[in-house]
Structures are given as structure tokens and as C-alpha cells.
Amino acid sequence: RKIPKVGHTFFQKPESCPPVPGGSMKLDIGIINENQRVSMSRNIESRSTSPWNYTVTWDPNRYPSEVVQAQCRNLGCINAQGKEDISMNSVPIQQETLVVRRKHQGCSVSFQLEKVLVTVGCTCVTPVIHHVQ
Amino acid sequence: GITIPRNPGCPNSEDKNFPRTVMVNLNIHNRNTNTNPKRSSDYYNRSTSPWNLHRNEDPERYPSVIWEAKCRHLGCINADGNVDYHMNSVPIQQEILVLRREPPHCPNSFRLEKILVSVGCTCVTPIVHHVA
């Protein structure tokens, strides 16, 4: 929040904001930073002690249509010998993202913002042990 | 959502592309099943590659707050609770879509923006470069 956007040294007057019908917002879906690439460490999904696979979900009425989801390969974690250690747990790490949903109602179409939970990868954790009384 | 009338006759041929600008309902639909037992808040401490969370604030963005992960160690925590530098803690990064106010400071006009966030950390075997 502390960093102002470069080139905007003045504040918009409300009258210079585009008119928007009540209860809605104007959304330009031309993505800023569309071509930036993830500079994640190389193939960490295979090198992790809690490795994961990726699957692509496709929905033509969602923007973006493609959403990539990760699934942990194992319940346990991979030890130094390359074997699964079930005394540890592979668990999914999740993050919310926004998508635009296109809805058809008869011959009309409407658009709705949606929060989607994406599984990003997995991490290896010490299990929580519940002691039975 | 905000309803936009289709062409007269309502043809079957479906426009596959989204229009560049859309009017969307201010209410955000939540697809997330919050009963998911895997959504645990303590992985950041229990992980062999633990991380700290930092609150990133930006009023020109929606959501205005995003929590970012930073790995605590270069190495990973071993069975004895010590940092093992033969393994590496690395951030798991994800591109997410957020809304950016456009023009700036306008309450109900946005543009989609792709940002890269670190969500957590994972423990990996290092890439060893052998010098010839």
C-alpha cells in the first residue's frame, strides 16, 4: 500500500471515474502482467520431499478457462533414501484466486466474480498426534 | 450478476471469447468449500520448510490484503529439529488474479492483474552442479 503507482501523482476526482450501474463494477479483463512468467525453482514438484502432480481444469464459462491444480503424490514424505516415510505427512498448500464466471439465463448472459481455491503445491509436515484418553 | 441481453433470436452459436470489458456483480461468489479439513493454519510452523507470513497491503488492489510467505531457513528442519543444509527450503509461488483499480482510486472500476505470490515453502533436494 505504501508504494504509489508510477505516473499517478494526483488523485482521481470522483467525477472522472466511469459511471457504473448500482450494484455492479466495471471490469477490464485484459490482464496486466499477462506475459510474466513464474520464476520458480526448476521442477520443485518432483524434487520436493512432498512431491506433487499437476492437473489442468478447463471450463469455457470461466475466465481464465484454464486453472492448474496440484495434488500431493503421497500421504507421507520422501526420505533421504527415496522411500516414503509415513511418520510425516505431505499436505496441500492452497491459495485463493479470482476468476470471472459467465452465466447463461435463457437468452441472457451475466458475469460474476468468483473466489476459487487453488492447490499450489505440497509441503512436508510433522503430523498432529491426538492422544486418546 | 448483471444481465446482458443476447442477440435477437438467441442463436445456438456460442461466442467462445469473453468480451474485453464486462459488468460484474459487486458480490463475489465463494466457490471454496470451507469445510475442507486440509485447510490448516499451522502448516507454516509444522513444515520441515517452515515459513513466516507477511501482510502485504495495497488499497488499489482487490483483495487489498494478501499474506505472503517467506521461508525461515535456507535448509530444512531434520528429525532432530535442526536445520539440514543438504536440503533446501524453497518458496512455492503461484500466479493469482487480483483486481487493480483503474483509473486509480475509482471505487467500482477495475482491471484484472496477474501477480506472483509466495504461498508457502517446500523442502527440495538441491540441484548439484558438477564443475568439469
Epitope: K2 | P63, S64
Partner: antibody, heavy 119, light 107 residues
Framework: EVQLVQSGAEVKKPGASVKVSCKAS????????FHWVRQAPGQGLEWMGV????????AYNQNFRDRVTITADKSTSTAYMELSSLRSEDTAVYYC????????????WGQGTLVTVSS | EIVMTQSPATLSVSPGERATLSCKAS??????VGWFQQKPGQSPRLLIY???NRYTGVPARFSGSGSGTDFTLTISSLQPEDFAVYFC?????????FGQGTKLEIK
């Protein structure tokens, strides 16, 4: 209906600690941040810190950093604020407030907990 | 930290009249300002968020304006239940800060 119900009034001696609770109901506890704000008698409001119960992240006002700890228990949908090394100037009403992290504003507040520090 | 300064400290207005409360930020806070009403023995109640958006259930007589450093809360026609203390607050950057309050009293 969203409700934030705080624990009852406390009287503490200087140097002691106090732990105030805030139980949430009527929404998914892990979806929103919890902030703690205090108000000394006849004074304005002072932000103390925040926790996100969904990921465990915390952030504190530097003025309290060494003395305040904010935690959350997902099993009971309760947030806690513990303030240590109490002094007389910590006498105040302590509020928890829900913060909408997407929209960026406080919407619901607890009823407040009066903490009196007196020898 | 950002300092929020409210004026006046006390405002005496007759019921039915208009009340204008001011809030100044020590640096630009965009539109990230909220206004709260507080009555004795009660917790703050949100009236306005993002400088000019009326919160759900808040009467139309309450309106907010401003951006950058100068913000105003206007109550168009004061009702008996409106006499209270009003706080402005910025959540542009943490630590989030509040004004010291304006006490709105019956003239």
C-alpha cells in the same frame, strides 16, 4: 447473523498479563482477519495488531510488538489477545474487529472488554 | 505512522440541521478511509467505507467524500439518535490509525 462476543472485564496488577478472548459466530472463522483495537478512557482508538485465522499470520503495531500476542483457535472460532507487562496506561476497553481482507474495511466489532490495571 | 486529525473536536448542531465533520490525513491515503459512529458504552459502528461508500443499513442522510488527504462526513438532517462521537480511520497502511474523534452534541 455475524456476532463477535468478548470475554468479561478484568482487573490486573501492574506487571501482570491479561488475555482477552473474542468468539466469532455466523460466518466462516478462517475467511477473515481479526484485529484488536483499544480505547483508553475518554480517548481515541489505537490499533494493536491482526491475525488471519486461515493461515496463522500475524502483524503488530510496533508500539506493542514486544508485549502483545494475538492467537486464534479454529476449533472454537475464538481469537485471543494477550498483553503482558501491564502498566496503568494500559487501562482501556479492548475491542476485536473483523476486517474484510478483500474489500479492506472493518465491519463487525465485539462489544469490548474493559481491562483495569491498578495496584 | 499516518496521523488522522479530526475537526472540530466538538460540534453543536440542532436536530434537522446539517453537520459536516472533517478529517485530515498526514499523508495521502487514497480512498482508504472509514467513518465510525460510537455512542457511550457501545462499540464503534461502521457508517462509511472507502471514503464514500455507505455501509449496509446506514441511513441515506450519512454521506462521505474526499480522497488523498482531506475527507468529510456529512449528515444531511440530524436525527436525535445521531448525536454521538464520530471517528475517521485509515487502513491505507499499517499501523492503522484513527482520528481522535468529533463529538456531535445537541445545540
Amino acid at each position: 447473523e455475524v456476532q463477535l462476543v468478548q470475554s468479561g472485564a478484568e482487573v490486573k496488577k501492574p506487571g501482570a498479563s491479561v488475555k482477552v478472548s473474542c468468539k466469532a459466530s455466523g460466518y466462516t472463522f478462517t475467511d477473515y482477519e481479526f484485529h484488536w483495537v483499544r480505547q483508553a478512557p475518554g480517548q481515541g482508538l489505537e490499533w494493536m495488531g491482526v491475525i488471519h485465522p486461515g493461515n496463522g499470520g500475524t502483524a503488530y503495531n510496533q508500539n506493542f510488538r514486544d508485549r502483545v500476542t494475538i492467537t486464534a483457535d479454529k476449533s472454537t472460532s475464538t481469537a485471543y489477545m494477550e498483553l503482558s507487562s501491564l502498566r496503568s496506561e494500559d487501562t482501556a476497553v479492548y475491542y476485536c474487529a473483523r476486517f474484510l481482507t478483500y474489500e479492506g474495511y472493518f465491519d463487525y466489532w465485539g462489544q469490548g472488554t474493559l481491562v483495569t490495571v491498578s495496584s | 505512522e499516518i496521523v488522522m486529525t479530526q475537526s472540530p473536536a466538538t460540534l453543536s448542531v440542532s436536530p434537522g440541521e446539517r453537520a459536516t465533520l472533517s478529517c485530515k490525513a498526514s499523508q495521502s491515503v487514497s480512498i482508504d478511509v472509514g467513518w465510525f459512529q460510537q455512542k457511550p458504552g457501545q462499540s464503534p459502528r461502521l457508517l462509511i467505507y472507502h471514503a464514500s461508500n455507505r455501509y449496509t443499513g446506514v441511513p441515506a442522510r450519512f454521506s462521505g467524500s474526499g480522497s488523498g488527504t482531506d475527507f468529510t462526513l456529512t449528515i444531511s438532517s440530524l436525527q436525535p439518535e445521531d448525536f454521538a462521537v464520530y471517528f475517521c480511520q485509515q487502513d491505507y497502511s499499517s499501523p492503522y490509525t484513527f482520528g481522535q474523534g468529533t463529538k456531535l452534541e445537541i445545540k
